[in-house]
């Protein structure tokens, strides 16, 4: 025959299973509070280090660029492309247009200083957005040209020239001694010309944005 | 053979005006851009003005710009150079000189023997 | 405008030994590998002529004693033998930029 349990000793059993019950849901929130401060802690630690890097990358570029605008992008909106200011963003280039009257490799050389090179277009829509900050009676510089008068035209950065990614205006190139290409408004529309490389010009620079 | 020859100059009173011609032979003239350039007595070589070939872009120093003219005829051959509202300052033998060029720029591989023009009261 | 700065103002040279004229540039006359400076000599009631074209080019008919050399802001005319012909003004251009300029000129002498 079974002895029966005494009164005492059931509550005793009820008692441990209640504290092994409440031992394990402490010790859980206790892990979840641990783990959460744990990764708060290395999150914040993220954030900081990535804020950190960021400014120090933003020190940086102060040394050439006593300001830059930023704008957040990437699909978690995480990284910031910049372009000193005033400069216009457009894809993932920044643009200046200089109202200096320079040379044409004057006008390189002070792209060069700025860390870009003179504007180097691939495509339509590029052109496009170039032209709208363009004064319709100036002439700019593009980073074209032709040194040796053979023809054989070369941008400045070595991006291979190709003619079906032109927009020379009509009739243009024309001239041999003309070994710079300008960028202007004829007939009603923008389009490159061939000028004399020592004609003082105004000039478009172009260079990467700057990714912080 | 290349030739180049000025004529033109003289002597003008201040305010007075001169017109200097470049008679060129020997060479295909419509296809150079071409220039003057003079010297004072005693002083240094002085660029004056430069016509490009096709008479699309002339340029001038400020020492000269809106007193003198530069202006070709491609069918005679000939350069000129137009001088108005002259300054004792503008004193100098004026060469006709014709432009090469070489990479982004050009220099001058013949010169006229030049033509001398006074400026005195 | 860039300013060109000639020296020696006069040089006597024996015949037989080199003579070496400097010309400086106010700001860079070189872009790349092209060096925009250009040499001439004039002869006394002569127009100048041109001896070397892009530095050191030597133009076509200028005897090989002549030569140059230089990049940037300095560059020099080298006449390696002097002759007696060789008596003139030398003097230097740059064309990077309009306007084009001239130093002030070298005078070559013989001793």
């Known amino acids: 025959m079974v002895p029966e349990e005494e009164p005492q000793d059931r509550e005793k059993g009820v008692w441990w299973f209640q504290l092994k019950v409440w031992s394990v849901a402490v010790v859980s929130i206790l892990l979840l509070c641990v783990c959460f401060t744990v990764s708060s802690v290395a999150s914040h630690n993220f954030m900081y280090s990535k804020t950190v890097k960021r400014l120090s990358k933003l020190q940086e570029y102060q040394q050439y660029y006593p300001s830059l605008t930023c704008v957040m992008e990437g699909k978690d909106m995480e990284d910031w492309s910049c372009c000193p200011t005033p400069w216009t963003s457009f894809q993932s280039s920044c643009y200046f247009i200089s109202t200096v009257m320079q040379s044409w490799t004057k006008s390189q050389n002070n792209c060069s200083v700025m860390g870009a090179d003179l504007v180097v277009i691939n495509t339509k829509e590029e052109q496009d957005f170039i032209t709208q900050n363009l004064k319709i009676n100036s002439a700019y510089f593009l980073g074209l040209s032709d040194p040796k008068g053979w023809r054989h035209w070369q941008w400045v950065d070595q991006t291979p020239y190709n003619k079906n990614v032109t927009f020379w205006h009509s009739g243009e190139p024309n001239s041999p001694d003309e070994r710079c290409a300008i960028i202007n408004f004829r007939s009603e529309e923008w389009g490159w010309n061939d000028v004399h490389c020592h004609v003082p010009q105004k000039s478009i620079c172009k260079m990467k944005k700057i990714y912080i | 053979e290349v030739q180049l020859v000025e004529s033109g100059g003289g002597l003008v009173k201040p305010g007075g005006s001169l017109r200097l011609s470049c008679a060129a032979s020997?060479?295909?003239?419509?296809?150079?851009?071409m220039s003057w350039v003079r010297q004072a007595p005693g002083k240094r070589l002085e660029w004056v003005s430069t016509i490009s070939s096709g008479d699309s872009y002339t340029y001038y120093p400020d020492s000269v710009k809106g007193r003198f003219t530069i202006s070709r005829d491609n069918a005679k051959n000939s350069l000129y150079l137009q001088m108005n509202s002259l300054k004792a300052e503008d004193t100098a033998v004026y060469y006709c000189?014709?432009?090469?060029?070489?990479?982004?720029?050009?220099?001058?591989?013949?010169w006229g023997q030049g033509t001398t023009v006074t400026v005195s009261s | 405008d860039i300013v060109m700065t000639q020296s020696p103002d006069s040089l006597a040279v024996s015949l037989g030994e080199r003579a070496t004229i400097n010309c400086r540039a106010s700001e860079s006359v070189s872009f790349r590998t092209s060096h925009l400076m250009h040499w001439y000599q004039q002869k006394p009631g002569q127009p100048p002529k041109l001896l070397i074209y892009g530095a050191s080019n030597l133009e076509s008919g200028v005897p090989d004693r002549f030569s140059g050399s230089g990049s940037g802001t300095d560059f020099t005319l080298t006449i390696s033998s002097l002759q007696a012909e060789d008596v003139a003004v030398y003097y230097c251009?740059?064309?990077?930029?309009?306007?084009?300029?001239f130093g002030g000129g070298t005078k070559v002498e013989i001793k």
């Open positions: 000189a014709r432009q090469i060029y070489y990479d982004y720029a050009y220099y001058f591989d013949f």
């Open positions: 251009q740059q064309s990077i930029e309009d306007p084009p300029t």
């Open positions: 020997g060479f295909t003239f419509r296809s150079y851009g």
